[in-house]
Interface confidence: medium
């Protein structure tokens, strides 16, 4: 009778993770009598994978009895795959002995493949904001995914970015890989409501790729303008002067009144208007009691924008145009919600 | 000393259930596949169910599938059979049988106990 | 399902005669056959394993020959204590099947 072999029909097999791998071997022979053993990698350092006689292998399940003695299907199922799963698997036939059964025969192996989709691609923008006609770099990461070859694209409100560097690691075999890529984006003024999207398609996406994305709402700040107005005179000794705050953003503001460099009054935007482009306006206004000076008065509106130092515009107000009204104590009144004199 | 010793017999009606039970001893009961065969009044041997050392693979002779569950608690060196919808032809002395080879089968029925018999009559 | 044929049925001999009964597979079973002996009131003991190797403790008048669907069981030299019925057993596929079993007599 011819000697024994092993036959291991697939030289290699590719797996979906989260699906079930039929490793399959048979025998050519029943003889001699003894058990299988199957084995990823091989040498001293191989892992057991499943022995029929003893052990516990849950994941692992045989195609047939392989403990009935005419038995020549050694094929074995690995449920729910993994990429750690990937590796050279053996099939191997050993003799019945004593004390310990002896290797008689090894399969020629079949290399397990495991195709595993990349997680969903995460966008980081920078840590701090930065102001428009700034470089800004984002930053897009995926992982978990194999094989190797995976395409990655950058886009900005659907135009394709260019200005990008990526990586996939590690550049060695691996069981699963991931990627990395940054990409650098000039801010404009109007990016308030653009997005950034970082777009992954691999093969076991089956052409619908994974996206990332980030608001430039969370990247960028639009510093305000300013423009400090006279308004008509309101009453005979009265004079309203507006701050116009225009196209900020975010919308964390505070402005202060400085009447000759002192302070008036300080508030914080709360109803804001905002612009089709996503940035704010505000408005504040002093009314001032011109005949509570006897000089020229220099009224300055100052704002400190999200934490950023202050800036200001000034309006002189010039007083010796109007008649004095005797009595009165106060240089300006404030007309808002909150109305309250400052003396 | 191997050894097998059934429980569980008796008389039962037609429909009835009953469970036999198989206890082991003398031998590492993990590693061996077992079997139950069983012996009608005055008539020959009819193999009846096999059950792995696993116990992975299970068999049934076409006459009990689906009547009759074969299982084995490793721990407690116990092999079962549950026995429901009962027929007459069913009455038999029943057989626990173990085979001659640890972690293989095929090789036949080295060690039978002594049986126990099941009656099913109204 | 594998047939199990055996034949004869009953037999009756003398002590001292050589006692031959046949089995017949339906289909090939190689030499996946064994012969059992039961005593009346007794479980099956197994004589033969693999069609022709005899199980230890087993007196060496029994014997087994054969392969494939046409198999032999042999008492050389037939003793009062041989008398009991005889079953041929395949062990090729499930189900497991045995023969109708041969009855062993002494005249």
């Known amino acids: 009778e011819e000697e024994l072999q092993v036959i291991q029909p697939d030289k290699s097999v590719l797996v979906a993770a989260g699906e079930t791998a039929t490793l399959r071997c048979t025998a050519t022979s029943l003889i001699p009598v003894g058990p299988i053993q199957w084995f990823r990698g091989a040498g001293p350092g191989r892992e057991l994978i499943y022995n029929q006689k003893e052990g516990h292998f849950p994941r692992v399940t045989t195609v047939s009895d392989l403990t009935k003695r005419n038995n020549m299907d050694f094929s074995i199922r690995i449920g729910n795959i993994t990429p750690a799963d990937a590796g050279t698997y053996y099939c191997v036939k050993f003799r019945k002995g004593s004390p310990d059964d002896v290797e008689f025969k090894s399969g020629a192996g079949t290399e397990l493949s495991v195709r595993a989709k990349p997680s969903a691609p995460v966008v980081s923008g920078p840590a701090a904001r930065a102001t428009p006609q700034h470089t800004v770099s984002f930053t897009c990461e995926s992982h978990g995914f194999s094989p190797r070859d995976i395409t990655l694209k950058w886009f900005k409100n659907g135009n394709e970015l260019s200005d990008f560097q990526t990586n996939v690691d590690p550049v060695g075999e691996s069981v699963s890989y991931s990627i990395h890529s940054t990409a650098k984006v000039v801010l404009t003024r109007e990016d308030v409501h653009s997005q950034v999207i970082c777009e992954v398609a691999h093969v076991t996406l089956q052409g619908d790729p994974l996206r990332g994305t980030a608001n430039l709402s969370e990247t960028i700040r639009v510093p305000p303008t300013l423009e400090v107005t006279q308004q008509p005179v309101r009453a005979e000794n009265q004079v309203n002067v507006t701050c116009q705050v225009r196209k900020f953003y975010p919308q964390r503001l505070q402005l202060t009144w400085l009447e000759n460099g002192n302070v008036s009054r300080t508030e914080t935007a709360s109803t804001v208007t905002e612009n089709k482009d996503g940035t704010y306006n505000w408005m504040s206004w002093l009314l001032v009691n011109v005949s509570a000076h006897r000089d020229d008065v220099k009224l300055t509106c100052q704002v400190e924008h999200d934490g950023q130092p202050a800036v200001s515009k000034s309006h002189d107000l010039k007083v010796s145009a109007h008649p004095k009204e005797q009595g009165s104590n106060t240089a300006a009144e404030n007309t808002g919600s909150n109305e309250r004199n400052i003396y | 000393e191997v050894q097998l010793v059934e429980s569980g017999g008796g008389l039962v009606k037609p429909g009835g259930s009953l469970r036999l039970s198989c206890a082991a001893s003398g031998f590492t009961f993990s590693s061996y596949s077992m079997h139950w065969v069983r012996q009608a009044p005055g008539k020959g041997l009819e193999w009846v169910s096999s059950?792995?050392?696993?116990?992975?693979?299970?068999y049934y002779a076409d006459s009990v599938k689906g009547r009759f569950t074969i299982s084995r608690d490793n721990a407690k060196n116990s092999l079962y059979l549950q026995m429901n919808s009962l027929r007459a032809e069913d009455t038999a002395v029943y057989y626990c049988a173990k085979e001659p080879r640890s972690y293989w089968h095929g090789y036949g029925m080295d060690v039978w106990g002594q049986g126990t018999t099941v009656t099913v009559s109204s | 399902d594998i047939q199990m044929t055996q034949s004869p049925s009953s037999l009756s001999a003398s002590v001292g005669d050589r006692v031959t009964i046949t089995c017949q597979a339906s289909?090939?079973?190689?030499?996946?056959l064994n012969w059992y002996q039961q005593k009346p009131g007794k479980a099956p003991k197994l004589l033969i394993y693999d069609a022709s190797n005899l199980e230890t403790g087993v007196p060496s008048r029994f014997s087994g020959s054969g392969s494939g669907t046409d198999f032999t069981f042999t008492i050389s030299s037939l003793q009062p204590e041989d008398i009991a019925t005889y079953y041929c057993?395949?062990?090729?596929?499930?189900?497991?099947?045995f023969g109708g079993g041969t009855k062993v007599e002494i005249k």
């Open positions: 057993q395949q062990l090729s596929n499930y189900p497991i099947t």
């Open positions: 059950i792995s050392s696993s116990p992975s693979h299970i």
């Open positions: 289909q090939d079973i190689s030499n996946y």
